[in-house]
């Protein structure tokens, strides 16, 4: 069962698996949630001990029964991991802690104007896990405004001390705020010859990359495949680092694969969720339970529902024995990875999907695209919404995209003449406008946030957020789209689609069925040539065919320009403006979402 509340002055007795330092009980709970085995924790505040070295300790605990005896202890705060909960879990921690110094290896010291600048510096430094900033009131003159960047092997502080006039906080890499580049390529037949910080077993290079991305110290990895000549190293995932942040030496070796941590774009890739099945494969580990079930999917479901299960192996039934039920072995290990991987055993193995909720919902795979035709099918664009106005009569006003469970991203120009959010209705999971009746459920709009630099669509800043009155429950037909990652600034998107209920030609009407069109992106230089009377800024992005024929049009405004990259859909543009519709050499102009990621996060995470 999911228990989110914290228990003050309560200590959970026993079950200790690790002790870390965290600046708050709330952060301790997040650390526990991300630890492969932690189910409960006890955090020691300042008042709990005479010994300052015991302050801010976060003791991570496990229990076969999923509970532990409670003991009264002043200043202790205890609670449960969010593993048992179904809600979204984020490692992002934007809190700034006053008069605390989180200890680690101080590897960079420089002047910063503010704690925010120091935090940004940490976020954009490949090694930085957390920082301490000496404010201008710090007693030691030379240290005033000094920003210390820190890292540790575990990503958590080695200690936390009280220190007047300083502030401390964490890197915001896990908040999608890093400007560091993301190298998504996996290099075949390559070994990175740098120091290993850890090694785990993985069934493929992509799981290895996810483990590296989740590991605070891992910057790149090498994976030895099943065909690697040295048997003892097969399926071995080596987590690596270097001072420069890049591999110093690349060695050509067949049957090895290497790649990079995706820590700075982890919000738009699955990091925790290993959803594949591995056939003819056994995962070894500590056995939790053996249950007879029908099929490997059922076995995975069982593992997902058992909070301590990390991975499983399903042994299919022999012939027609046992009503076709095979044996489902639920397993765990100290680090969440199999202790050994055996091939050629006839088993089917995989991982719990319980951790999928630690990834952004937007990374979930959706139905495969329907090729051909212009009409969409249900669930094809689950982030697309239709925004209606009820004044003077109800009608479709604009498109929009779900980017969070209470947030719709759309265009600012949609709200010309809209006096109040009260007249707006957001319909989600809609394919045909004709589905919308008097009694069709909708989401009211609590707030319209228009970019304060917006004047008109053609001059840019054509972006707005709608805060919904209630939260959206995600399903196959309604879920968010990922924002582009700042680390993916150099990605060239080749699979982009514009969707909407807008006109098909300049003088037309709103379409009943959601339309789709695959449209190539156009460089800004090329786009500028087509719009000599306008300034095409880097905050705009253009898409269209030279010969015209396919384009967004009236009524599509605010809707998404969605691009698929590495199996994940990203909201690359917001339909904004253009000269006519689908005209020759007149591409559509879209708001370049990448340039507004900071603005979006600032508004939605406030």
């Amino acid at each position: 069962e999911c228990v989110t509340r914290l228990f003050k002055d309560i200590h959970f007795e026993g079950g200790d698996i690790a002790t870390v330092f965290t600046p708050s009980a709330k952060h301790c709970q997040v650390v526990c949630t991300h630890h492969p085995r932690c189910l409960l924790f006890t955090f020691t505040g300042e008042s709990a001990s005479e010994d300052p070295t015991q302050w801010f300790t976060c003791v991570l605990k496990d229990s076969v029964t999923e509970t532990l005896p409670r003991v009264n202890r002043t200043g202790a705060i205890s609670g449960y991991s969010f593993k048992q909960c179904s809600h979204q879990i984020s490692a992002c921690n934007k809190d700034i802690y006053v008069d605390l110094d989180m200890k680690g290896i101080n590897y960079n010291s420089s002047l910063a104007k503010s704690a925010q600048e120091c935090q940004e510096r940490c976020t954009d430094d490949i090694h930085c896990h957390f920082f301490t900033y000496a404010t201008r009131q710090f007693p030691s003159l030379e240290h005033r405004n000094i920003c210390l960047l820190k890292h540790t092997q575990t990503g958590t502080p080695t200690g936390i001390m009280k220190l007047d006039k300083v502030v401390t906080g964490f890197s915001l890499k896990s908040c999608a705020l890093s400007n560091l580049a993301c190298i998504r390529d996996v290099f075949p037949n390559t070994v990175f010859a740098d120091s290993n910080i850890d090694s785990v077993m993985a069934p493929d290079a992509f799981v290895c990359r996810r483990i590296c991305t989740h590991h605070p110290g891992c910057l790149f990895f090498t994976f030895f495949s099943q065909e690697w000549p040295k048997e003892s190293q097969r399926n071995l995932c080596l987590l690596k680092t270097s001072e420069s942040g890049l591999p110093s030496t690349r060695i050509k070796k067949s049957k090895a694969l290497s790649g990079f941590s995706l820590q700075s774009c982890r919000h738009s890739i699955p990091v925790f969720c290993h959803s594949s099945f591995y056939h003819d494969t056994d995962f070894l580990g500590e056995e939790l339970d053996i249950v007879a079930v029908k099929g490997h999917e059922a076995c995975q479901k069982l593992c997902t529902n058992a909070v301590r299960c990390q991975f499983f192996t399903y042994a299919p039934a022999q012939a027609s024995c046992n009503e076709g039920k095979g044996k489902c072995y639920l397993k765990l290990s100290s680090n969440g990875s199999p202790t050994k991987i055996l091939r050629g055993t006839g088993g089917i193995s995989g991982y719990t999907l319980r951790l999928c909720k630690m990834d952004n919902e937007c990374t979930t795979k959706i139905k495969p695209r329907i090729v051909g035709g212009t009409a969409s099918v249900r669930g094809e664009w689950p982030w697309q919404v239709t925004l209606h106005t009820t004044s003077p009569t109800q009608r479709h006003l604009c498109g929009g995209s779900i980017i969070g469970n209470q947030w719709i991203l759309t265009a600012a120009h949609c709200f010309y003449g809209v006096e109040s959010p009260k007249i707006l209705r957001v319909y989600i999971g809609i394919l045909n406008q004709s589905e919308i009746k008097e009694d069709t459920s909708f989401f009211g709009v609590q707030e319209i946030i228009i970019h304060d630099q917006y004047k008109m669509a053609e001059s840019g800043y054509d972006i707005a957020l709608l805060k919904l009155e209630t939260t959206v429950n995600y399903t196959d037909s309604q879920r968010p789209i990922c924002l582009p990652s700042k680390g993916d600034r150099n990605v060239i998107y080749t699979d982009c689609w514009v969707t909407g209920w807008g006109y098909r030609k300049l003088r037309d009407k709103i379409q009943n069925t959601l339309q789709k069109a695959k449209i190539p992106l156009v460089t800004n230089d090329e786009c500028q040539k087509r719009y000599r009377g306008h300034k095409i800024t880097h905050k705009m992005i253009c898409a269209g065919y030279r010969e015209g024929g396919k384009d967004a049009c009236k009524g599509d405004s605010g809707g998404p320009l969605s691009c698929k990259h590495n199996e994940v859909w990203h909201l690359v543009g917001i339909t904004s403006w253009g000269e006519g519709c689908a005209q020759r050499e007149r591409p559509g102009v879209y708001t370049n979402v990448l340039e507004y990621v900071d603005w979006i996060l600032e508004k939605t995470q406030a």
Epitope: N108, S109, S110, F138, S140, E142, L163
Partner: antibody, heavy 124, light 107 residues
Framework: QVQLVQSGAEVKKPGASVKVSCKAS????????MHWVRQAPGQGLEWMGI????????SYAQKFQGRVTMTRDTSTSTVYMELSSLRSEDTAVYYC?????????????????WGQGTTVTVSS | EIVMTQSPATLSVSPGERATLSCRAS??????LAWYQQKPGQAPRLLIY???TRATGIPARFSGSGSGTEFTLTISSLQSEDFAVYYC?????????FGGGTKVEIK
């Protein structure tokens, strides 16, 4: 052992510039700040400015603002102090002195290691 | 800027005697004060920092006290090698400033 070795004596004409170097050894160069202090003949000590060798940020005394430039070369663990538009009053011994350890937030400190000094004479 | 004033300008003391040097700040510098010793032809040497903490290798006969605006350096029993010029310096605000110095000479 920890030491700061400065460049040799200089004789300059008024209006010229002088660049004094200070090479650090025996400690992690980028972990400590570096000050420049001067002393005119028979006079007291006068603080000129400070450089953080890690990021290269500087802070100068108002009196020298616009005339002094402090730089560093991390590859050779050397800091430089350049004083331009020299006048006779700039005749002095120029010292570099190690300041605070910047990799920890300590409260109090002093200039604990000094260079041997570089005599700069400005004369027409 | 903070003005540091040292007194006396010259102090004549016999070896083995106690010497007391004063330093006054034009505004509070808390405990952010250092004392240096300088002998002719040599670079200054750090004696005391934080108003009262002896630097590494400094003999126990040197002690510092005071906070705010009034500070004292005491040499409990002067040795022949202690005859030099002593400077105080504030570390509380930019620009860093030194006192004019006190010359301790043999009586």
């Amino acid at each position: 052992q920890v030491q700061l070795v400065q460049s040799g004596a200089e004789v300059k004409k008024p209006g010229a510039s002088v660049k004094v170097s200070c090479k650090a050894s025996g400690y992690t160069f980028t972990s400590y700040s570096m000050h420049w202090v001067r002393q005119a003949p028979g006079q007291g000590l006068e603080w000129m400015g400070i450089i953080n060798p890690s990021g290269g940020s500087t802070s100068y005394a108002q009196k020298f603002q616009g005339r002094v430039t402090m730089t560093r070369d991390t590859s050779t663990s050397t800091v430089y102090m350049e004083l331009s538009s020299l006048r006779s009053e700039d005749t002095a011994v120029y010292y570099c002195a190690r300041g605070a350890y910047l990799m920890e937030l300590y409260y109090y400190y002093g200039m604990d290691v000094w260079g041997q000094g570089t005599t700069v004479t400005v004369s027409s | 800027e903070i003005v540091m004033t040292q007194s006396p300008a010259t102090l004549s003391v016999s070896p083995g005697e106690r010497a007391t040097l004063s330093c006054r700040a034009s505004q509070s510098v808390s405990s952010n004060l250092a004392w240096y010793q300088q002998k002719p032809g040599q670079a200054p040497r750090l004696l005391i920092y934080g108003a009262s903490t002896r630097a590494t290798g400094i003999p126990a006969r040197f002690s510092g006290s005071g906070s705010g605006t009034e500070f004292t350096l005491t040499i409990s029993s002067l040795q022949s090698e202690d005859f030099a010029v002593y400077y105080c310096q504030q570390f509380n605000d930019w620009p860093l400033t030194f006192g004019g110095g006190t010359k301790v000479e043999i009586k």
